[in-house]
Structures are given as C-alpha cells and as structure tokens.
Interface confidence: low
C-alpha cells in the first residue's frame, strides 16, 4: 500500500517528497528516517533539516533538490540490497498534531551487470555521531503527528492508531507534496 520506488544496486535511489513553503525562506523542519513513520518523528533518522539548513545527515543520504523551495526529496547514493524498505518523510509543521507523514517504499533490484568493486568506505564516515547541539538527537526523534490519507494511500504501521483527517491538498504525481500556509 506504500508508494513504491525502484533502483538497481550501485545506482542512486530517488525518493520524492515536497512541500510548498508559506513564504520564500520560511522553511519547515523535515526528517527522513528508515522505516515507516513511527509514533514520534522519524524512528531512525538518516537526514534532517531545520528552518535554515540541513543539520544532520549520514553517509550516502543527500538532498539534491532545492530544499529551500520545499524539494526535500532524498537521494541515496550507491544503493545496496540492504537499502530496500520503507522510508519516512516527515514535514514537521509547527503545532500539535500538524505533522505530515509520507511512507515511501524503496525496492532495490540486483544490477543487470555486476559493477566493478568499489573501494570500501571509511567505517567512521558511515556512522557519524549524532549532533549534540540543541534540538538534535532523539529529542527530535519523538514527534507525534498526523497521518494523512494521500491519494496513493500511504499507510504507516500506526495508521489505525494515528488516523487524522488532515489531507494533503497538493500531491504531485512524482511523490508526496504538501502546501504550508
């Protein structure tokens, strides 16, 4: 029931997620996590933005679009079969129960041609420490929010518990879109 996106081993995967800022530069915090959107925020955060910038990211996860215009689509570099699964894009609209959550399913297919082996990445680079500045780490791993019914019926594992009547009016065919303001 989740929206499904595909990529081959060794390629970059693209998971679309958009919102429309209320005004230029008036950004909304967004988190991306591995796994369906949980009760609070993004369960296993791989990337996060705040009102100004990308403030937390892990190796291989990038925002290649213009996030300052609301394109918070996630690119995962050089995917492996282990990257398969559900990802949560959560747009953290201020206020109680206002968050918009989107679950996107990534399916990784074996490469048609076996790619040449790449040099192993530095282990520590793959697991940077959680930022310790205020508002990072698990304090933001805990945001309860709404679960919108979007036209592709993205259903989180907590749909029955956190069903909310707010609908995303703007939904691009290419992925999740929400208009703020």
């Amino acid at each position: 029931s989740e929206v499904e996106y595909r990529a081959e081993v060794g390629q970059n995967a693209y998971l679309p997620c958009f919102y429309t800022p209320a005004a230029p530069g008036n950004l909304v915090p967004v988190c991306w996590g591995k796994g369906a959107c949980p009760v609070f925020e993004c369960g296993n955060v791989v990337l996060r933005t705040d009102e100004r910038d990308v403030n937390y990211w892990t190796s291989r996860y990038w925002l290649n679009g213009d996030f300052r215009k609301g394109d918070v689509s996630l690119t995962i570099e050089n995917v492996t079969l282990a990257d398969s699964g559900i990802y949560c894009c959560r747009i953290q609209i201020p206020g109680i129960m206002n968050d918009e959550k989107f679950n996107l399913k990534l399916v990784i297919k074996p490469a048609k041609v076996t790619p040449a082996p790449t040099r192993q990445r530095d282990f520590t680079a793959a697991f940077p420490r959680m930022l310790t500045t205020r508002g990072h780490g698990p304090a933001e791993t805990q945001t309860l929010g709404s679960l919108p019914d979007i036209n592709l019926t993205q259903i989180s594992t907590l749909a029955n518990e956190l069903r909310d009547s707010r609908l995303a009016n703007d939904l691009r065919d290419s992925g999740a879109t929400i208009r703020i303001g």
């Epitope: 609070f40 296993n44 201020p94 594992t157």
Partner: antibody
C-alpha cells in the same frame, strides 16, 4: 500485537556483570529506535539511552556512560543492556521501551547485594 | 537537566470523582519546531508504564476519553473526569523536548 519481552530477574554481587535482553515482536525491529529506562526503588524513572536500531548509534544520558553497554542483535530483534562492575546503586528494574516510549517491556529486576 | 515536578505526591479519590494532577517543568518544553513533548503515563503495581497522553493533550490508542491533558510552556495538567477502579496506580509525566529525557516523580492515585 506489539510486544517487548525482557529476560528474567537477576541477583548479582558487587563487581560482577549482568546482561539483560529485550526481544521485540509485532513490528519491524529496525524501523524503530529502542530506549532503556531505569527505575530504582523509591526513585524517579531515569532515561538511559536511545539507540538507533538501523545504524546502531546510541545517544546516552550522561549518567549512563562508562559501565553501561548497549547492543543489538537485529537478526533476532533483540536489544541488550550490559552493566559492568555492578554497584549496589544499580539495584533497580530496567525497562526497554520502543522508540517513542509508546510500548514498554515488562521490566527486568536486577538486585546487587553482597 | 530538565526537572519535572509533580503534585500532589498522593491523591486519594472516591470512585466517580474527578482527579487532577499537575506537572511543572524547570524550563519551557516548547521545542524549536513548535511542538511540546510532554507525555503522561500510568504505571500499575508490578507493571510497566503505559502511555496515556502524548504531546500534552492527545490520547494514545485505546485510552478512554475520561482522560484529558492540557497546559503549555512549563505548566501541565492531567485530568480524569470520573475515576474508575482500573485507573488506580502511579501517574508520571515525562518530557522529550530536551536531552536527557526526564520524568516526574509520580503521583499515586488511590481510593479514599
């Protein structure tokens, strides 16, 4: 349904090591972080750590750095708490709690006594 | 660390009465993203805590509507409109706005 099942009670002597487990079921283990929380007799609940079960990365409370080790066996959907060089003040019930502390294990009683 | 202070420590009630528990934090629990991460739990004897109310005022799955939460900033209240026997136990508030996450000392709801 979502369940967190913890290992049984432990009676240890000071200086020994204890390792307790928390086995999750009813959801995909690596989709949700895991917490450990300490409840000592007559004391306030104390949050110990939040572990990103996807990356294995822990975020600790300052009081629980050093003698405390937190680990995962993702293939078995299990989280572990190990306490080294046990002290009397480690006597408590230890709870695992899923990601947002929405679901909790039944608790594991650890008694440290000479 | 954020200190969470609950009052009263003990709350004797008659079944059917309304009960009110206060929780105050030593600093504002409004997060920079606008959310307030103040939650309420009930712990019955020999059991683990169960989530009742999340983010100040939202009832968790399966929680009866006689439970309600309110408040803002540093001052929060849990109300039980008509106490039933199954409501007896220790109530905790907790905050997830600031690391380390912290809990209140608990309020024991008991029969008069």
């Amino acid at each position: 349904q979502i369940q967190l099942v913890q290992s049984g009670p432990e009676l240890k002597k000071p200086g020994e090591t204890v390792k307790i487990s928390c086995k999750a079921s009813g959801y995909t283990f690596t989709n949700y972080g895991m917490n450990w929380v300490k409840q000592a007799p007559g004391k306030v609940l104390k949050w110990m750590v939040w572990i990103n079960t996807y990356t294995g990365e822990p975020t600790y409370a300052d009081d629980f750095k050093g003698r405390f080790a937190f680990s995962l066996e993702t293939s078995a959907s299990t989280a572990y708490l190990q306490i080294n060089n046990l002290k009397n003040e480690d006597t408590a019930t230890y709870f695992c709690a899923r990601d947002a502390m929405d679901y909790w294990g039944q608790g594991t009683s650890v008694t440290v006594s000479s | 660390d954020v200190v969470m202070t609950q009052t009263p420590l003990s709350l004797p009630v008659s079944l059917g009465d309304q009960a009110s528990i206060s929780c105050r934090s030593s600093q504002s629990l409004v997060h920079s993203n606008g959310n307030t991460y103040l939650h309420w739990y009930l712990q019955k004897p020999g059991q683990s805590p169960k989530l009742l109310i999340y983010k100040v005022s939202n009832r968790f799955s399966g929680v009866p509507d006689r439970f309600s939460g309110s408040g803002s900033g540093t001052d929060f209240t849990l109300k039980i409109s008509r106490v039933e026997a199954e409501d007896l136990g220790v109530y905790f508030c907790s905050q997830n706005t600031h690391v380390p996450w912290t809990f209140g000392g608990g309020t024991k709801l008991e029969i008069k």
